[in-house]
């Protein structure tokens, strides 16, 4: 069998809401993956599991099941959303993210994703990790950078 390639493209959008009383931030982060099937037979994408970390703490997890079938020598782009919560011992971030005197409220998040594919009864797991900037101060749609090695997110104006 030839390789199945998983490429984490980046954050597509981040939608933020706040609970002032609990000093909690809710970030719905939509990410984009490219999955390429280099084989001459179809491959099933069984599931995608993802988690997001902030300051070494897991702030969100998501799992997608029975996602899609990728045909021979084909590629599919898949978006998945991870709901995240920044609260409790990180409640100081509420002060940061809602402080309007700061124009861009970029925080560094670690995106981790594992894709499980299956073909001929055989399962394979491919994982990726990437640090990304996300603005916790406003809803943002990002232009996905194409570079494999550098993913600089620029908020659309």
């Amino acid at each position: 069998p030839r390789s199945i390639e998983v490429k984490y493209i980046g954050v597509k959008s981040a939608y933020v809401s706040y609970d002032a009383e609990k000093r909690t931030i809710y970030l719905n982060i939509t990410n984009t993956l490219n999955i390429t099937n280099n084989n001459y037979y179809s491959v099933e994408v069984e599931n995608i599991t993802a988690q997001v970390q902030f300051s070494k703490t897991v702030i969100g997890k998501a799992r997608l099941n029975n996602i899609t079938n990728i045909g021979p020598l084909d590629m599919k782009q898949i978006d998945y959303t991870v709901p995240t919560v920044i609260a409790e011992e990180m409640s100081y971030m509420y002060d940061f993210c809602t402080l309007l005197s700061i124009k861009v409220h970029n925080i560094v998040l670690m995106m981790q994703v594992t894709v499980t594919t299956a073909y001929f009864g055989h399962s394979e797991q491919i994982s990726q990790e990437r640090y990304q900037y996300v603005d916790c101060g406003r809803n943002t749609t990002y232009q996905l950078a194409q570079s494999e090695y550098l993913n600089v997110l620029q908020p659309q104006q």
Partner: antibody, heavy 117, light 112 residues
Framework: EVQLVESGGGLVKPGGSLKLSCAAS????????MSWVRETPEKRLEWVAF????????YYADNVKDRFTISRDNAKNNLYLQMRHLKSEDTAMYYC??????????WGQGTLVTVSV | DIVMTQAAFSNPVTLGTSASISCRSS???????????LFWYLQKPGQSPQLLIY???NLASGVPDRFSSSGSGTDFTLRISRVEAEDVGVYYC?????????FGGGTKLEIK
């Protein structure tokens, strides 16, 4: 317990200089923006200056711009306000305050600055 | 600059009864993120100001629930449900929507 302790106030002649300090403890200083706020003899509160957690954003009230400089030393948990070309209208009690989206959550006890001949 | 307007004195209030303090801003303090950037502080005699209410309606840590606040984008009211002697002082409203942050002139709570 969060504590902010100001120092450096005193009596100074018009045109003179003073440097105020604010020692922070009881919280992770480098996580928070800080502001200086002053209380005039007429008991009015005026925001003076702002500095973001990492010092990347700095703002001043128009009446102190080009005369006052706010700075911070996150390694020492200290906030500063360098005041130059002082005027009589700068006479006030100066407070440092922890700043953020939830307001000035903590204030120091204040340090009095008197500008007089 | 945003102008914050307060009456200098409240109506004299009897201990144990309720009191209201008003504040008006020259511009709506409701941001597009859904937060209203209006804050209330109390300065007791001889003390530093202390935060009472953040983001228009949220009680700051350690503040008794006798205090509450409500408002629209420009008109705000601080309510004290059962006034106690320790509530005496000057109440300031502040906007943090735009720089420069601006304070109201303060309202002195008067006890009968």
């Amino acid at each position: 317990e969060v504590q902010l302790v100001e120092s450096g106030g005193g009596l100074v002649k018009p045109g003179g200089s003073l440097k105020l300090s604010c020692a922070a403890s009881g919280f992770t200083f480098s996580n928070y923006a800080m502001s200086w706020v002053r209380e005039t003899p007429e008991k009015r509160l005026e925001w003076v200056a702002f500095i973001s957690d990492g010092g990347g954003y700095i703002y001043y009230a128009d009446n102190v711009k080009d005369r006052f400089t706010i700075s911070r030393d996150n390694a020492k948990n200290n906030l500063y306000l360098q005041m130059r070309h002082l005027k009589s209208e700068d006479t006030a009690m100066y407070y440092c305050a922890r700043d953020g989206g939830t307001g000035f959550t903590y204030w120091g006890q204040g340090t009095l600055v008197t500008v007089s001949v | 600059d945003i102008v914050m307007t307060q009456a200098a004195f409240s109506n004299p209030v009897t201990l144990g009864t309720s009191a209201s303090i008003s504040c008006r801003s020259s511009k709506s303090l409701l941001h597009s993120n859904g937060i209203t950037y209006l804050f209330w502080y109390l300065q007791k005699p001889g003390q530093s100001p202390q935060l009472l209410i953040y983001q228009m309606s949220n009680l700051a840590s350690g503040v008794p629930d006798r205090f509450s606040s409500s408002g629209s984008g420009t008109d705000f009211t601080l309510r004290i449900s059962r006034v106690e002697a320790e509530d005496v002082g000057v109440y300031y409203c502040v906007q943090n929507l735009e720089l420069p942050y601006t304070f109201g002139g303060g309202t002195k709570l008067e006890i009968k």
